[in-house]
């Protein structure tokens, strides 16, 4: 449909009613009048023969919608300290706010800005940092499965993967890595001992469950903390 | 396609009584308010009635009140136009029309007609 | 007599710019309800020509225009072609009658 002209005010045939999304009805007037585009806002309304009369909104205010107001909206105050300002107040935008690194907001506002942030939970040994997130964006712990560890205290550590020994000389287990014993002279042969790489740490969309001590199915924490062992069956 | 047509129109006597049908295809026909607007030989054109997409309303032409009654069946995808007492001047080619849906209602589609004639 | 009146006929030569005027009353245009113009070819159904006063449906083209002011309408036509030789009607709703109403009509010739 090509573009449409403005043509209001006028008045709606009965049975129909004004384009929503840009114009108004005004009772006084009995017409479709235009709206005001987002950065401004109504100065005066409009009558049988004249249309809307629009200003731009003032310094910290603002309008974000096609809009029949009075007057412009206030911007939401500066970002705190803790806080980022991710998109500045505008004509036609309110300020939004985000936590800085290492913290999450605690209280968010019904336009997507933060009002309050918190310092990120830290998981402890026998805990790493699930891929998702708390619904609130905090940090969710789960307890690290069989063949995993994690000794740290932290908000961004995962539960890394224990090494694979050629001889293991201790098992390790949720909190400890495994610990793999010297090679022996008369087993020269078998292979080095191997690492297993560490995934970096991963960050995905919040899950529908809060914070606790084991985000692990039951079914594998019920295992244990059992290592795995590769054992070499080459011999002289 | 968008289409329109008319149907039932035809030879009456005086006083007599016809309907005229108006199939719609290619269109969601419950969402458009749909007119009934005739054409007498060599005359302009004359708007008869008007009904809203869900039929609760409804406008005739004062030339029409009373004798006419326009109806849709939207199950049906059809336009109605009942016509009682008919007179001579009612003479003319029966257009079925549909009002565009959201800039201002013009009647942007239109059906090829159906004629009436009414004699004795 | 119609509620709004246009003039029976108009003319103009290919090329030439061609107005043909809708006067209504307070009750239809000068109440502020929209008008729109219908073209009839010979032997056709009416098509919708200018909608909302001055808007273009899709494949109408832009030698068509349209505006409103106070209690009447007026659609122009440039560069007069002769396929646009057909009868030109103007609509609008009228308060007092309570239903839509057309113009009498102009009949286009485009000459030589």
């Known amino acids: 449909v090509p573009a449409q002209v403005v043509l209001t005010p006028y008045k709606p045939e009965p049975g129909y009613e004004c384009q929503i999304s840009q114009e108004y009805y005004d009772r006084k007037a009995q017409m479709c009048c235009a709206k005001c585009p987002p950065g401004q806002y109504v100065k005066h309304f409009c009558n049988k023969t004249s249309d809307t009369v629009c200003a731009d909104c003032e310094a910290s205010m603002y309008t974000q919608v096609w809009n029949q107001f009075r007057t412009c909206l206030s911007c939401s105050s500066s970002c705190t300290t803790d806080q980022v300002e991710i998109r500045a107040c505008t004509k036609q935008q309110n300020r939004v706010c985000a936590c800085e690194a290492g913290r999450y907001c605690a209280l968010k506002t019904h336009s997507g800005s933060c009002r309050q942030c918190m310092r990120l939970s830290k998981c402890g040994p026998g805990f790493g940092v699930a891929s998702s997130r708390a619904p609130n964006g905090n940090v969710l712990c789960k307890a690290c499965a069989p063949g995993t560890f994690s000794d740290t205290t932290s908000s961004t550590d995962v539960c890394r993967p224990h090494r694979i020994c050629s001889i293991l000389a201790i098992p390790g287990n949720a909190s400890t890595d495994a610990v793999c014993a010297p090679e022996s002279p008369t087993l020269s042969a078998i292979p080095r001992t191997l690492y297993v790489s560490q995934p970096e740490p991963t960050r995905s969309q919040p899950l529908d469950q809060e914070p606790g001590p084991s985000q692990t199915p039951s079914i594998l924490t019920s295992l244990g903390s059992t290592p795995i062992i590769e054992q070499s069956t080459k011999g002289g | 396609e968008v289409q329109l047509l008319e149907s039932g129109g035809g030879l009456v006597q005086p006083g007599g009584s016809l309907r005229l049908s108006c199939a719609a295809s290619?269109?969601?026909?419950?969402?458009?308010?749909m007119s009934w607007v005739r054409q007498a030989p060599g005359k302009g054109l004359e708007w008869v009635s008007t009904i809203i997409g869900s039929g609760a309303n409804t406008w005739y032409a004062d030339s029409v009140k009373g004798r006419f009654t326009i109806s849709r069946d939207n199950s049906k995808n059809t336009l109605y136009l009942q016509m009682n007492s008919l007179r001579a001047e009612d003479t003319a080619v029966y257009y079925c029309a549909r009002h565009e849906g959201y800039y201002y209602y013009g009647m942007d589609v239109w059906g090829q007609g159906t004629l009436v004639t009414v004699s004795s | 007599q119609s509620v709004l009146t246009q003039p029976p006929s108009a003319s103009g030569t290919p090329g030439q710019r061609v107005t043909i005027s809708c006067t209504g009353s307070?009750?239809?245009?000068?109440?502020?309800?929209?008008v729109h113009w219908y073209q009839q070819l010979p032997g056709t159904a009416p098509k919708l020509l200018i909608y909302?006063?001055?808007n273009r449906p899709s494949g109408v083209p832009d030698r068509f225009s349209g505006s409103k002011s106070g209690t009447s309408a007026s659609l122009a036509i440039s560069g007069l072609r002769s396929e646009d030789e057909a009868d030109y009607y103007c609509a609008a709703w009228d308060d007092s009658l309570n239903g839509r109403v057309f113009g009498g009509g102009t009949k286009l010739t485009v000459l030589g």
């Open positions: 307070s009750s239809n245009i000068g109440a502020g309800y929209v």
């Open positions: 909302g006063n001055s």
């Open positions: 290619g269109f969601t026909f419950s969402s458009y308010a």
